[in-house]
Interface confidence: medium
């Protein structure tokens, strides 16, 4: 899972201003995993604030691992954060709010919520439990905050920011509720 629509402020021991991340896993230590393959991968370094190369063992590890420099930059660098913040400031819905409900191909039948662009409201649907798309929320409130006009209680950018004084995350999400499941 990745925590979408929630920003993490990383305070590092550098002269740079606090680093804002849209995904907490961008702060995970690079983890080569328990296997012994030699695979070139990329991770986001919270200290240099750049995507860098590392050697991955081929299994295990964590989500701060990308097949290309471009993918790493797209997910973890400031340009991406600015784009998402700009979207929020303009009170525009993220693109994925306009995706159709997608149960995926599995047969788990889990209750989830999606934004219905016809009714302009968040509605319940049955999710199969795998694949699907990002218009898929665990709670009605999450869906409303993300996709409905007016954004639910509080809404807006204030809900995005959550400061945490951390160094490297050790590979698991920070200790607070996670938001929205990100499926490809």
């Amino acid at each position: 899972d990745s925590e979408e629509d929630e920003e993490y402020t990383i305070i590092t021991d550098t002269e740079l201003p606090p680093l804002k991340l849209m995904h907490s896993f961008c702060a995970f230590k690079p983890d080569d995993g328990p296997c012994k393959a030699i695979m070139k991968r990329f991770f986001f370094n919270i200290f240099t604030r750049q995507c860098e190369e590392f050697i991955y063992g081929g299994c295990g590890g964590n989500q701060n691992r990308f097949e290309s420099m471009e993918e790493c930059k797209k997910v973890c660098t400031r340009d991406n954060v600015n784009r998402i913040i700009q979207t929020a400031l303009q009170k525009e819905k993220p693109d994925f709010c306009f995706l159709e409900e997608d149960p995926g191909i599995c047969r788990g039948y889990i209750t989830r919520y999606f934004y219905n662009n016809q009714s302009k409201q968040c509605e319940r649907f049955k999710y199969g439990g795998c694949l699907g798309n990002m218009n898929n929320f665990e709670t009605l409130e999450e869906c409303k905050n993300t996709c409905e006009d007016g954004g639910g209680s509080g809404g807006g950018l204030n809900d995005i920011f959550e400061a945490q004084k951390i160094e490297w995350h050790e590979g698991g999400p920070p200790h607070h509720h996670h938001h929205h499941h990100h499926h490809h």
């Epitope: 899972d1 990745s2 896993f25 989500q63 997910v75 159709e100 997608d102 149960p103 995926g104 191909i105 599995c106 047969r107 788990g108 439990g129 795998c130 694949l131 699907g132 798309n133 698991g172 499941h181 990100h182 499926h183 490809h184």
Partner: antibody
Framework: EVQLVESGGGLVQPGGSLRLSCAAS????????MSWVRQAPGKGLEWVSA????????YYADSVKGRFTISRDNSKNTLYLQMNSLRAEDTAVYYC???????????WGQGTLVTVSS | QSVLTQPPSLSGAPGQRVTISCTGS?????????VQWYQQLPGTAPKLLIF???NRPSGVPDRFSGSRSGTSASLAITGLQAEDEANYYC????????????FGGGTKLTVLG
């Protein structure tokens, strides 16, 4: 009796294209998501792509994203895989399979061999 | 390297019980996603053996059983028979950044004769 029959495999040069087909019978084709799974010679199984019953949702493994396109024609009970920019590492037997219970592939075709070589 | 880890090979004598393990992580088996098992006889397509962790499709003998606990799963075969000699694959879903259906590397089961 459920039957899945793949066709369209063959020898192609790196950078080339190929279109695989899978003819389905013995079940209500439009009610089932379908997948392509491949197996390189002497290796294990690798999921390639999947498509929902209606064809409205498609999914791809990272290794083929942007190069392969899955589609279906429910009026012809046929599943397709358009493969472009083929690489040597795409050499494999390609199976089509239908997604039934849970995340499982209930039935598989016999496979069609794709060889990418110059 | 496969996302799910299986032993490359196992062997057993006819009549014996063998267990094939499948180890995953917190983003697949540990995230409560079902595991499936497939049998692939030499030169043939895979065949579904177990779905939803421990369910057998019709026609699969009850000598085959599956289980899942935490980040691991296993396939047990009792009363081993010569025709059980095959490759066995576990399969699940992985919800990591590029979510996809994932397989184990396969286990070659040899029935000693």
């Amino acid at each position: 009796e459920v039957q899945l029959v793949e066709s369209g495999g063959g020898l192609v040069q790196p950078g080339g294209s190929l279109r695989l087909s899978c003819a389905a019978s013995g079940f209500t084709f439009s009610s089932y998501a379908m997948s392509w799974v491949r197996q390189a010679p002497g290796k294990g199984l690798e999921w390639v792509s999947a498509i929902s019953g209606s064809g409205g949702s498609t999914y791809y493994a990272d290794s083929v994203k942007g190069r392969f396109t899955i589609s279906r024609d429910n009026s012809k009970n046929t599943l397709y895989l358009q493969m472009n920019s083929l690489r040597a590492e795409d050499t494999a037997v390609y199976y089509c399979a239908n997604n039934g219970a849970a995340a499982a592939w209930d039935y598989w075709g016999q496979g069609t061999l794709v060889t990418v070589s110059s | 390297q496969s996302v799910l880890t299986q032993p490359p090979s196992l062997s057993g004598a006819p009549g014996q019980r063998v267990t094939i393990s499948c180890t995953g992580s917190s983003s697949n088996l540990g995230a409560d996603y079902d595991v499936q098992w497939y049998q692939q006889l030499p030169g043939t397509a895979p065949k579904l053996l177990i779905f939803g962790n421990n369910n057998r499709p019709s026609g699969v003998p009850d000598r085959f059983s599956g289980s899942r606990s935490g980040t691991s799963a296993s396939l047990a075969i009792t009363g081993l028979q010569a025709e059980d000699e095959a490759n066995y694959y576990c399969q699940s879903y992985d919800r990591s950044l590029s979510g996809s259906m994932v397989f184990g590397g396969g286990t070659k089961l040899t029935v000693l004769g």
